[in-house]
């Protein structure tokens, strides 16, 4: 230790009165680059948040119902390259959700100008029962919906072949799966290529002749034996899905019409949806034709605008 | 169906060889591993190497042949054998195999089918 | 590295006879095993696949068995033809290494 101690002092010996001005001078300028790091620091968090607010207005989680298809008619195909994939695509349009608070209610017109003549009026005198009602139409403040198409298509020269066993180096493997779906007697056929992918333990394989991928996903398992050892792998088709189109759009109701002010209001939610499709129901009241009315007085309910 | 062996030849040590295996009667498919074996005189079968006749086109070597001795196909019926830095070790007659898989496996495999070989001397 | 071992080197038996050679393998080689015929000037001949099954073609004289790491090929009413070479030979499919593919020694069978 003593002999460290030396060595220390020998050191500050040899340094000049220069240097340590030079040091001061460092320790300054360390100084000002830990507050500008600071500050940066605050900026990138800051920035951080308002990205993660922005990215959560652009995430839509959808329910979409079930669809009944029509099948039209059958396409004869001009070549063999349009036997080798079924494609398909499908529109999908989000339902807008409204949520109408207590107090509130929604008037759809059947008519646009009605509702842009019921909206100008702004304030309107409602007979509820006994009560004289004030109420204010106001355009409905319509949050973002989306619009896109999902195009799918799913190849017949492809299949996906999923659990396959890591009992093998990358390269046997690969000729392990092209040997045994190129077996006929286990209804594989000539096989064009073998994407192999050890991590996942999953392949797409690719065959030469169409027909052999539907042949062999007719069971949902293929037998893959390895040293005598059988592994049955599991067999789906090989689909692509792109999405295409993709829209967002927002705006308000040209036909529907928000209605406040029915706060006080404790009646039933359906006597009183009917009393305001009678007031506007009437031509005198700036109303006209009625399609839907939506009361909310106790809890509040969601209503899904649609194009 | 038959394999023939060609390009052996006498060289001086150092010297490079390039060996063809040419396949009539069958082209190359999935269930064939196409390999080299050579035999020096008077002693037993060594294997050198295989490359898998399917789409992967997988290369197999015996740890002393990496290096210096590599395996092709150069089209679905033939296949060929690089040798460089060759010794007076390496003087054999290098047989072409076709490998067979025999089961609906690929467990089971046999060489069911050899060319007559082709004779390398290396000598100065 | 996969290592065959051929035993005996040399064998001889008077026609009618029975030889038996026997392959060991350094790993286990799952019956994946052939055994093959060779005569002076000659390529070698496929006799037996998967350790036990016989090549079409080959008489049933020729008899292989054996699993694991122990193998065993048997040759019964033996005929003068039946002097030759006979060498084991396996590939393996393995996680650690290449398809390692090994010849054993030979074994040579006199006929008297």
């Known amino acids: 230790m003593e002999a460290d101690k030396d060595d220390t002092q020998q050191i500050l010996k040899e340094h000049s009165p220069d240097e340590f001005i030079k040091d001061e001078q460092n320790k300054g300028l360390i100084d000002e680059i830990t507050k500008k790091n600071i500050q940066l620091k605050k900026e990138i968090q800051k920035l951080e948040t308002e990205l993660q607010e922005a990215t959560k207005e652009f995430q839509i989680k959808e329910d979409i119902p079930e669809t009944k298809m029509k099948f039209l008619s059958v396409e004869t195909p001009e070549n063999d390259s349009q036997l080798s994939n079924i494609s398909c695509s499908f529109q999908v349009s989000s339902k807008v959700p409204y949520e109408i608070q207590k107090g509130q209610a929604l008037i759809t017109f059947e008519k646009e100008e009605v509702a842009q003549n019921v909206v100008s009026m702004s304030k309107h005198h409602v007979q509820i029962k006994d009560v004289n009602l004030e109420v204010t139409a106001k355009p409905v403040p319509l949050n973002s919906g989306v619009r896109f198409q999902v195009y799918v298509e799913v190849s017949k020269m492809k299949i996906n072949v999923t659990e396959i066993p890591d009992t093998l180096r990358e390269d046997q493997m690969r000729d392990k799966l092209e040997l045994s779906f190129s077996k006929s007697r286990n209804g594989g056929g000539e096989v064009d290529r073998v994407d192999y992918d050890r991590q996942s333990g999953s392949a797409v394989i690719t065959f030469v002749e169409i027909g052999v991928a539907d042949k062999i996903l007719k069971k949902k398992e293929y037998p893959l034996y390895i040293n005598q050892t059988c592994h049955r792998v599991t067999v789906s088709p090989y689909t692509e899905i792109h999405l295409k189109k993709y829209q967002i759009f927002s705006g308000t109701s040209k036909r529907t019409v928000l209605l406040t002010g029915m706060e006080g209001i404790q009646m039933d939610e359906e006597i009183v949806e009917d009393l305001i499709n009678i007031h506007f129901q009437r031509a005198k009241n700036g109303g006209g034709e009625v399609d839907v009315v939506k009361c909310s007085l106790g809890q509040p309910h969601i209503a899904y605008f649609e194009e | 169906q038959s394999l023939e062996e060609s390009g052996g030849d006498l060289v001086k040590p150092g010297a490079s060889l390039t060996l063809t295996c040419t396949a009539s009667g069958f082209s190359f498919s999935s269930s064939y591993y196409m390999c080299w074996v050579r035999q020096a005189p008077g002693k037993g079968l060594e294997w050198i190497a295989c490359i898998y006749a399917g789409s992967s086109g997988s290369t197999y070597y015996a740890s002393w042949a990496k290096g210096r001795f590599t395996i092709s196909k150069t089209s679905s019926t033939t296949v060929t054998l690089q040798m460089t830095s060759l010794t007076a070790a390496d003087t054999a007659t290098y047989f072409c195999?076709?490998?067979?898989?025999?089961?609906?496996?690929?467990?089971?495999?046999?060489?069911?089918?050899w060319g007559p070989g082709t004779l390398v001397t290396v000598s100065s | 590295a996969l290592v065959m071992t051929q035993t005996p080197s040399s064998v001889s038996a008077a026609v009618g006879g029975t030889v038996t050679i026997n392959c060991q393998a350094s790993?286990?080689?799952?019956?994946?095993l052939a055994w093959y015929q060779q005569k002076p000037g000659q390529p070698p001949k496929l006799l037996i696949y998967g350790a036990s099954n016989l090549e079409s073609g080959v008489p049933s004289r020729f008899k292989g068995s054996g699993s694991g790491t122990e193998y065993t090929l048997t040759i019964s009413d033996l005929e003068c033809d039946d002097a030759a070479t006979y060498y084991c030979?396996?590939?393996?499919?393995?996680?650690?290494?290449?398809?390692?593919?090994?010849f054993g020694g030979g074994t040579e069978v006199v006929v008297k």
């Open positions: 790993q286990n080689i799952y019956t994946n």
């Open positions: 030979q396996s590939s393996l499919y393995s996680r650690i290494a290449d398809r390692a593919n090994a």
């Open positions: 195999a076709r490998e067979y898989s025999y089961d609906d496996y690929g467990d089971f495999w046999g060489a069911n089918l």
